[in-house]
Amino acid sequence: MAVTACQGLGFVVSLIGIAGIIAATCMDQWSTQDLYNNPVTAVFNYQGLWRSCVRESSGFTECRGYFTLLGLPAMLQAVRALMIVGIVLGAIGLLVSIFALKCIRIGSMEDSAKANMTLTSGIMFIVSGLCAIAGVSVFANMLVTNFWMSTANMYTGMGGMVQTVQTRYTFGAALFVGWVAGGLTLIGGVMMCIACRGLAPEETNYKAVSYHASGHSVAYKPGGFKASTGFGSNTKNKKIYDGGARTEDEVQSYPSKHDYV
């Protein structure tokens, strides 16, 4: 019962986490204009992984996609890649974990197979969560670096007369969504891995049955056979982990009233 609960909870937590990772990846507010200690502009800038937006005090919001691939910073490309890998792994993990759920019966699937699938999805969720956390952290680091660089050169001009005030960017909502979502996916993955241990059937201790034939004593030990197939308790963890690792390798606008905050 506890195993089913752990597995179910792990699935739900991972599902919420992956939904959050998808949401964060699609969000426009990865970096937002720093309003602290800045002249009060009637224009608010914010940027996402795919486009940058400008919201005017009039309520009009204009977003422009990054229509270049080669012209984008390598770090931004890396963040995009990490987030996409996280989403793909998470989605496959969800698919696998649905079939692995103890409460769902599919044909004559044995518990051992479900245990394998649970561990596989667990590992996928862990990697997915790590990808999201890494992606968000790389972007955050990029922001911090740029923030201090632009603070150092905040006022540029000739003869002390201020000509240009550089726009500084700070952490946007998407970063926090990404961190939380990545963490949830990671936790869900760990829960799935824990659930996997309880899913694999324990070895049944049968008494050795002796058959006497033509004076020779031959003992058949069912447990020994079970062990040799990889379902016995002595090798189950290693066997399932191998299966898990193998699977992992294979997967290698006019303004509206809500526009202005």
């Epitope: 204009q33 002249p39 009060v40 502009t41 009637a42 224009v43 800038n45 940027q47 940058s52 937006c53 400008v54 005017e56 005090s57 009039s58 309520g59 009009f60 204009e62 422009r64 201020v162 000509q163 240009t164 005030v165 550089q166 726009t167 303004p255 009233k257 526009d259 202005y260 905050v261």
Partner: antibody
Framework: EVQLVESGGGLVQPGGSLRLSCAVS?????MNWVRQAPGKGLEWVAW????????TYADDFKGRFTISRDDSKNTLYLQMNSLRAEDTAVYYC???????????WGQGTLVTVSS | DIQMTQSPSSLSASVGDRVTITCKSS????????????LTWYQQKPGKAPKLLIY???TLESGVPSRFSGSGSGTDYTLTISSLQPEDFATYYC?????????FGQGTKVEIK
């Protein structure tokens, strides 16, 4: 079609108060009050987000003037307190548009501060 | 506050003339986010409310004749009337639409020569 109609102007004594109204028909996200003293240029007074009610004022009017709106009546207001002779002007309400330009203006209402 | 300085303060011209009004801001009105300059031009005739001509320094408001054009970036901006018409005799104002408080230039009066 957006229409803006101001009212509430008139003669007031120095130190007195006056409330200007601007009836708004049509879609508006944010609104402004702009004034023009006789024979002088345009002077921006205040801005308001018509949905959140968030205001912003020019430094000269902070504390004396209050911009507000009534959602139910679709009306914009400018409450003017501690009026001075130099506040004598035609007051316009104007709608903010793309590029933060003011695309629709009212006909203006004259406020005269004199003893 | 941002200072907006217009020049000349007044000018005399004839119908058909090319007229240029300049506006200088004390700070750049260029927004890095969309590479647009938040400078607006208005026309005002005596006893009337101002009329929006140009926003984003060079974008013509709908219904405004194409003889009006705007240019410039950063701190220096220009309003040009390619061929002055009788109805164009008025006062023209530039406005900072980037920083609060929004500030207007002192105006340029275009009179008949």
């Amino acid at each position: 079609e957006v229409q803006l109609v101001e009212s509430g102007g008139g003669l007031v004594q120095p130190g007195g108060s006056l409330r200007l109204s601007c009836a708004v028909s049509g879609y508006t996200f944010s609104m402004n009050w702009v004034r023009q003293a006789p024979g002088k240029g345009l002077e921006w007074v205040a801005w308001i987000n018509m949905y959140t009610g968030e205001p912003t004022y020019a430094d000269d009017f902070k504390g004396r003037f209050t911009i507000s709106r009534d959602d139910s009546k679709n009306t914009l207001y400018l409450q003017m307190n501690s009026l001075r002779a130099e506040d004598t002007a035609v007051y316009y309400c104007a709608r903010s548009s793309r590029g933060n330009g003011f695309d629709y203006w009212g006909q203006g209402t004259l406020v005269t501060v004199s003893s | 506050d941002i200072q907006m300085t217009q020049s000349p303060s007044s000018l005399s011209a004839s119908v058909g003339d090319r007229v240029t009004i300049t506006c200088k801001s004390s700070q750049s009105l260029l927004n890095s986010g969309n590479q647009k300059s938040y400078l607006t031009w208005y026309q005002q005739k005596p006893g009337k409310a101002p009329k929006l001509l140009i926003y984003w320094a060079s974008t013509l408001e709908s219904g405004v004749p194409s003889r009006f054009s705007g240019s410039g970036s950063g701190t220096d901006y220009t309003l040009t009337i390619s061929s002055l018409q009788p109805e164009d005799f008025a006062t023209y104002y530039c406005q900072n639409a980037y920083y609060f408080p929004f500030t207007f230039g002192q105006g340029t009066k275009v009179e008949i020569k």
